[in-house]
Amino acid sequence: LECYSCVQKADDGCSPNKMKTVKCAPGVDVCTEAVGAVETIHGQFSLAVRGCGSGLPGKNDRGLDLHGLLAFIQLQQCAQDRCNAKLNLTSRALDPAGNESAYPPNGVECYSCVGLSREACQGTSPPVVSCYNASDHVYKGCFDGNVTLTAANVTVSLPVRGCVQDEFCTRDGVTGPGFTLSGSCCQGSRCNSDLRNKTYFSPRIPPLVRLPPPEPTTVASTTSVTTSTSAPVRPTSTTKPMPAPTSQTPRQGVEHEASRDEEPRLTGGAAGHQDRSN
């Protein structure tokens, strides 16, 4: 069996002029093609792998959502010579005219890595973007993580940073066929320069509350005593708990998986999500 072979990071690697063909090992009777597209509110990019596969012919498409970061995965295996070039690998930035420029920034800024190499997405070197609220969702958190695609015995990975709907997620992730999108969220502008070592705290531990100093009981007292609690004190309010500092009580994110009836279109923003602001 002869299959196309290439590895694409963002928009480099599987361009038609750069395509290779490979002869598969004896016993390998499928060609494989996998594409994973990631869309932030500031742009979209894709990873792709083509080569000799394993298993049975067929298709597997999936749509995933990680706190407003959308991922679309297409995996296709086929049993004919050079049959693995059917998926469109093109990705492009979302057109700002229909998106962020039409909506006011919400005051939060995040580092953005959309299709950038690991070298270009280090520390404070990536571009800074202004977050905005889209599709009735508030994007006030910043994200730092990775997307990984594995197929045809090849693993390709790129960093992802941008604005998300969660400010406290820690080492959170979603998975699809041969695909993982994972990372952590944080609160505050430009807080996502490096969240690799972010520590997880259980959301069940309430925040520490510093009590005000008690009123003096006698006029003769010459020293003022400040009391702080040795054990956590729950907020007495029965409505929302007090917002916790990022470093103390990040809350665990929940994996969301959105099954999609239509096939994800990987050209110019993923299907159904071209304009994230409406």
Epitope: A10, S15, N17, K20, L116
Partner: antibody
């Protein structure tokens, strides 16, 4: 119908600059890799530069590296080639070419750049 | 000096079969990269003739065929016609140069 229309060629002195444009129509420009390919009079084809659909990946031939800059404006469906420090050996017809599903599937009619003193 | 080597000229009479070779190296054709062929009629822009070693775009007659083996590729034209008189170029990606490379071109003359 896919159309690529180059412009901006002309006569220029060695060391001078020119900016070529390629207006694209009939396809989704923002999804296509694009290239500039040149052909010196009576000679063969020589690839010059390559730009990805989003503009984030760019390649140059060694012969033009540091002197030429490829860019694109997806909102205007236009590809550009800024040519600085031009030399006599840059004299050629410059073609803009689209990379379709396979190879360079559409080419413009070309624009002539003549570098002479 | 082109990275891909083609004979500068080839000729044949109408109805004949003509083959044009394209020799590369381990950094292009030999690395597994697919080979494309372009036809350039006199005074016109190049046109894609064969892509992906042996595939024809729609509208290209089946008289044109391509093949690839090792570090070489070839273009065959059977049932030669006068309108086939043109320059033919092979092309492939090159790892060392990080870009597509062209052969020097072969001028095909249809005799008689």
């Amino acid at each position: 119908e896919v159309q690529l229309l180059e412009s901006g060629g002309g006569l220029v002195q060695p060391g001078g600059s020119l900016r070529l444009s390629c207006a694209a129509s009939g396809f989704t420009f923002s999804n296509a890799w694009m290239s500039w390919v040149r052909q010196a009079p009576g000679k063969g084809l020589e690839w010059v530069s390559y730009i990805s659909s989003s503009g984030s990946t760019i390649y140059y031939a060694d012969s033009v590296k540091g002197r030429f800059t490829i860019s694109r404006d997806n909102s205007k469906n236009t590809l550009y080639l800024q040519m600085n420090s031009l030399r006599a050996e840059d004299t050629a017809v410059y073609y803009c070419a689209r990379e379709g599903l396979w190879a360079f599937d559409y080419w413009g009619q070309g624009t002539l750049v003549t570098v002479t003193s | 000096q082109s990275v891909l080597t083609q004979p500068p000229s080839a000729s044949g009479t109408p109805g004949q079969r003509v083959t044009i070779s394209c020799t590369g190296s381990s950094s292009n054709i030999g690395a597994g990269y697919v080979v494309h062929w372009y036809q350039q009629l006199p005074g016109t822009a190049p046109k894609l003739l064969i892509y992906d070693n042996n595939q024809r775009p729609s509208g290209v007659p089946d008289r044109f065929s391509g093949s690839k083996s090792g570090t070489s590729a070839s273009l065959a034209i059977s049932g030669l016609r006068s309108e086939d008189e043109a320059d033919y170029y092979c092309a492939a990606w090159d790892d060392r140069l990080n870009g597509p490379v062209f052969g020097g071109g072969t001028k095909l003359t249809v005799l008689g």
